[in-house]
C-alpha cells in the first residue's frame, strides 16, 4: 500500500457551532500500538498537533479535544467538543513513526447553530439556558 | 495528468491593479494548499506566501503583506493572485506551485506569468 | 528571516565533470519536528523550477541518481557526479523550516 492508504478518514467533517464532532480514522494492520495524533493546520511540516494516544486504548483530553484509539478494530476517534467557528480548519488524522509520519486531511467546518427564541430577545436578562452553562463551568472549577 | 495553467503576460501601469490566475487540473484543488513565488528579471525566487485552498485562508510572507491578495475560485479549481496599486518593483514573473501530500518541496509548478509594470 | 548563501554564483564545468555547490543557511533549520527542510531546484532558462532534492538527502522521483544531497544544521551540498548538457541551468537551495520560507540566491552551471 502507498505511503497514503495506510491510514484514512473522512475527507469532510460538518459540526454545529457550540454542539461536538467526531472523526474516526481507520489504520491498516500494523500500526495498532503506534502513537495516534490530530493536528491542526493545511500545511503538514507546521500543523500542530492538538492531542495525541498515550500508545494505549486509553482517551487522552486535552481542552475541548479528545483521541482514543481502539486496536482491535483499527480505528481512533477524536472528538471535539464546544464547537467555536474558529474551530473550522484543515485537521490531520495522524501516525506517529520513525522518518515520516503517516497522516491523512480532513476539512472540518463549523455551522452556525441555530438561533433559539430566547436568544433573538431583546431581554438582557440571562436566560435559563445561559445559566445552565455557566453552572456547568462553576461546577467545573 | 497534474497540471498548474498560469493566465498570460499582463502589462500594467504603476498605480493600477493585476489579477493573476492559476487553473489546478488532474488532482483535488481543495486538498493541496497553493504557494505563490516572485522572480524579478534576472533575479532569484522569493517565496510569497500562500492560501488554504479548503478554506481560502491567506498567509503572506512580511515583504507582500499589504497590496497582495491571494483568493480562490474553488467552483473553477483556481486560484488567484492580485496586486493593487502597482510599483516598479513588481514586475517579475509569478509563480503558483503546489506541495507534496507530506510537504516535501514543490512538485509541481505553474508556467510562470510576466508582469511588467510601465508607464 | 533565515539568509540562505549559495556558493559559487557561477560554475562553469566541463561535461562530464563533478560540479559541487554550497549552500549555507544563517541559522539552523532543523524543523521543531526534528525534521530538516532544505531542498533544491534546478531552472533551466524559460522555464519554471524543478525539484531535484528534498529533506536534504532525499532525491525526487525521476531524478537521476547523479544529483545527491547532503549536510546538516547550517551547511549544505548539492553534487552532480557526472554533469550532462540537461544539468545547465541555475540551482536554488531553499528552506521550508522557517516561516518566511527562504530560496539561496542561485547558482548558475554552465559550459566551461
Known amino acids: 500500500y502507498s505511503i497514503v492508504t495506510q491510514i484514512t478518514g473522512p475527507t469532510t467533517v460538518n459540526g454545529l457551532e457550540r454542539g461536538s464532532l467526531t472523526v474516526q480514522c481507520v489504520y491498516r494492520s500494523g500500526w495498532e500500538t503506534y502513537l495516534k495524533w490530530w493536528c491542526r493546520g493545511a500545511i503538514w511540516r507546521d500543523c500542530k498537533i492538538l492531542v495525541k494516544t498515550s500508545g494505549s486504548e486509553q482517551e487522552v483530553k486535552r481542552d475541548r479535544v479528545s483521541i482514543k484509539d481502539n486496536q482491535k478494530n483499527r480505528t481512533f476517534t477524536v472528538t471535539m467538543e464546544d464547537l467555536m467557528k474558529t474551530d473550522a480548519d484543515t485537521y490531520w488524522c495522524g501516525i506517529e513513526k520513525t522518518g515520516n509520519d503517516l497522516g491523512v486531511t480532513v476539512q472540518v467546518t463549523i455551522d452556525p447553530a441555530p438561533v433559539t427564541q430566547e436568544e433573538t430577545s431583546s431581554s438582557p436578562t440571562l436566560t435559563g439556558h445561559h445559566l445552565d452553562n455557566r453552572h456547568k463551568l462553576l461546577k467545573l472549577s | 495528468q497534474i497540471q498548474l495553467v498560469q493566465s498570460g503576460p499582463e502589462l500594467e501601469k504603476p498605480g493600477e491593479t493585476v489579477k493573476i490566475s492559476c487553473k489546478a487540473s488532474g488532482y483535488t484543488f481543495t486538498n493541496y494548499p497553493m504557494h505563490w513565488v516572485k522572480q524579478a528579471p534576472g533575479k532569484g525566487l522569493k517565496w510569497m506566501g500562500w492560501i488554504n485552498t479548503y478554506s481560502g485562508v491567506p498567509t503572506y510572507a512580511d515583504d507582500f503583506k499589504g497590496r497582495f491578495a491571494f483568493s480562490l475560485e474553488t467552483s473553477a479549481s483556481t486560484a488567484y493572485l492580485q496586486i493593487n496599486n502597482l510599483k516598479n518593483e513588481d514586475m517579475a514573473t509569478y509563480f503558483c506551485?503546489?506541495?507534496?501530500?507530506?510537504?516535501?518541496?514543490?512538485?509541481?509548478w505553474g508556467q510562470g506569468t510576466t508582469l511588467t509594470v510601465s508607464s | 528571516d533565515v539568509l540562505m548563501t549559495q556558493t559559487p554564483l557561477s560554475l562553469p564545468v566541463s561535461l562530464g565533470d563533478q560540479a559541487s555547490i554550497s549552500c549555507r543557511s544563517s541559522?539552523?533549520?532543523?524543523?521543531?519536528?526534528?525534521?530538516?527542510?532544505l531542498e533544491w531546484y534546478l531552472q533551466k532558462p524559460g522555464q519554471s523550477p524543478k525539484l531535484l532534492i528534498y529533506?536534504?538527502?532525499n532525491r525526487f522521483s525521476g531524478v537521476p541518481d547523479r544529483f545527491s544531497g547532503s549536510g546538516s544544521g547550517t551547511d549544505f551540498t548539492l553534487k552532480i557526479s557526472r554533469v550532462e548538457a540537461e544539468d545547465l541551468g541555475v540551482y536554488y537551495c531553499?528552506?521550508?523550516?522557517?516561516?518566511?520560507?527562504?530560496f539561496g540566491g542561485g547558482t548558475k552551471l554552465e559550459i566551461k
Open positions: 531553499f528552506q521550508g523550516s522557517h516561516v518566511p520560507w527562504t
Open positions: 506551485a503546489r506541495m507534496d501530500y507530506y510537504s516535501n518541496g514543490f512538485n509541481y
Open positions: 529533506k536534504v538527502s
Open positions: 541559522q539552523s533549520i532543523v524543523h521543531s519536528n526534528g525534521n530538516t527542510y
